[in-house]
Interface confidence: low
């Protein structure tokens, strides 16, 4: 199995998709596990509903959710509020009895938050000058500033 890289931004959600042959894996529950070391075991994080027919229902374990489109053959894992410690190797698995087939090996990479809200100065880049216009260019988006929110941090 090749490893597929999924990149997410810290503090945001990351969706990981694992396609599979829906006929081959018909009736099988799925799981998402974290690889412990290069040749270590894969520690279960979350698995789909105990009743295979209800696999489409999202199941959570902490900040990780799993849902399975058994007809279309796509397992989807959502990592909510992604954090640096979430980075690492994972597997999507198809379960049968006590065995597990690997559907996809996944490397999760966590990129820094574009705005570190703990420190307004700790940005990817801190400066905003007059050449940066506070203009909404996408008409479908309208957003009002919250009380006390500064649209652009001042350059220090």
């Amino acid at each position: 199995h090749n490893t597929t890289v999924f990149q997410g931004v810290a503090g945001q959600s990351l969706q990981v998709s694992c396609p599979y042959d829906s006929m081959k894996h018909w009736g099988r529950r799925k799981a998402w596990c974290r690889q412990l070391g290069e040749k270590g075991p894969c520690q279960r994080v979350v698995s789909t509903h105990n009743l295979w027919l209800l696999s489409f229902l999202r199941r959570w374990n902490g900040s990780t959710a799993i849902t399975d489109d058994t007809l279309g053959g796509t397992l989807t894992i959502t990592l909510r509020n992604l954090q640096p410690h979430d980075a690492g190797l994972y597997q999507c698995q198809s379960l049968h009895g006590s065995e597990a087939d690997t559907l996809r090996k996944v490397l999760v990479e966590v990129l820094a938050d574009p705005l570190d809200h703990r420190d307004a100065g700790d940005l990817w880049f801190p400066g905003e000058s007059e050449s940066f216009e506070d203009a909404h260019v996408e008409h479908s988006i309208s957003r009002s500033l919250l009380e006390g929110e500064i649209p652009f941090p001042p350059t220090s």
């Epitope: 945001q12 996408e138 649209p151 220090s156």
Partner: antibody
Framework: EVQLVESGGGLVQPGGSLRLSCAGS????????MSWVRQAPGKGLEWVSV??????????GYNPSVKGRFTISRDNSKNTLYLQMNSLRAEDTAVYYC?????????WGQGTLVTVSS | DIVMTQTPLSLPVTPGEPASISCQSS???????????LNWYLQKPGQSPQLLIY???TRASGVPDRFSGSGSGTDFTLKISRVEAEDVGVYYC?????????FGQGTKVEIK
């Protein structure tokens, strides 16, 4: 794998218009600032424009050299970045790169050549 | 605008030997948060630029450890500990402190 693919370049007369596109894949497009950087033939790099991410209202910024003539935008449903270039001048002749912006321009497209000439 | 000045503009190198490029900014790029907003890029012949170093000294993902960045608020250096043939191209420094982002004029590194 992060990929950026530009298109839309070509030959245009001074005063004319052109719209460049950049299709992004392999990352959550709405989470990232996106930018355009250009390079005149045989010259160095010049930053052109930036558009912020969803969390920051998709606001836009421009280099004073293009402000009022160029407009950056994005269609997030298509994971595509655009640069609308109006009132083009000979000095706008360059390869235009779209780039994802994090700690720096961390991923670049292959570039598309814009030639402004009569 | 912050002006970025690179020296030398051309640098002939010998594979296996070290190389050094300097960059100077017209304003300090040291932010009050302690980070210095200076980046280095390499544009190999016929290719798009690639990010090498950010925050003056942090290597970007996948960049070999023979590349290192150092400096102060206004004077910066990119060092290659042992030049390899694949390192040829034009190196650019860039300030990321304020808009408009500006680049140095580039340093062309070529094998002697």
């Amino acid at each position: 794998e992060v990929q950026l693919v530009e298109s839309g370049g070509g030959l245009v007369q001074p005063g004319g218009s052109l719209r460049l596109s950049c299709a992004g894949s392999g990352f959550t497009f709405t989470d990232f600032y996106m930018s355009w950087v250009r390079q005149a033939p045989g010259k160095g790099l010049e930053w052109v424009s930036v558009i912020r991410n969803k969390a920051n209202g998709y606001t836009a910024g421009y280099n004073p050299s293009v402000k009022g003539r160029f407009t950056i935008s994005r269609d997030n449903s298509k994971n595509t970045l655009y640069l609308q270039m109006n009132s083009l001048r000979a000095e706008d002749t360059a390869v235009y790169y779209c780039a994802r912006l994090t700690y720096g321009f961390d991923y670049w497209g292959q570039g598309t050549l814009v030639t402004v000439s009569s | 605008d912050i002006v970025m000045t690179q020296t030398p503009l051309s640098l002939p190198v010998t594979p296996g030997e070290p190389a050094s490029i300097s960059c100077q900014s017209s304003k300090s790029l040291l932010h009050s948060n302690g980070k210095t907003y200076l980046n280095w890029y390499l544009q190999k012949p016929g290719q798009s630029p690639q990010l090498l170093i950010y925050w003056m000294s942090t290597r970007a993902s996948g960049v070999p450890d023979r590349f290192s960045g150092s400096g102060s608020g206004t004077d910066f250096t990119l060092k290659i500990s042992r030049v390899e043939a694949e390192d040829v191209g034009v190196y650019y420094c860039q300030q990321f402190l304020e808009y408009p982002f500006t680049f140095g004029q580039g340093t062309k590194v070529e094998i002697k």
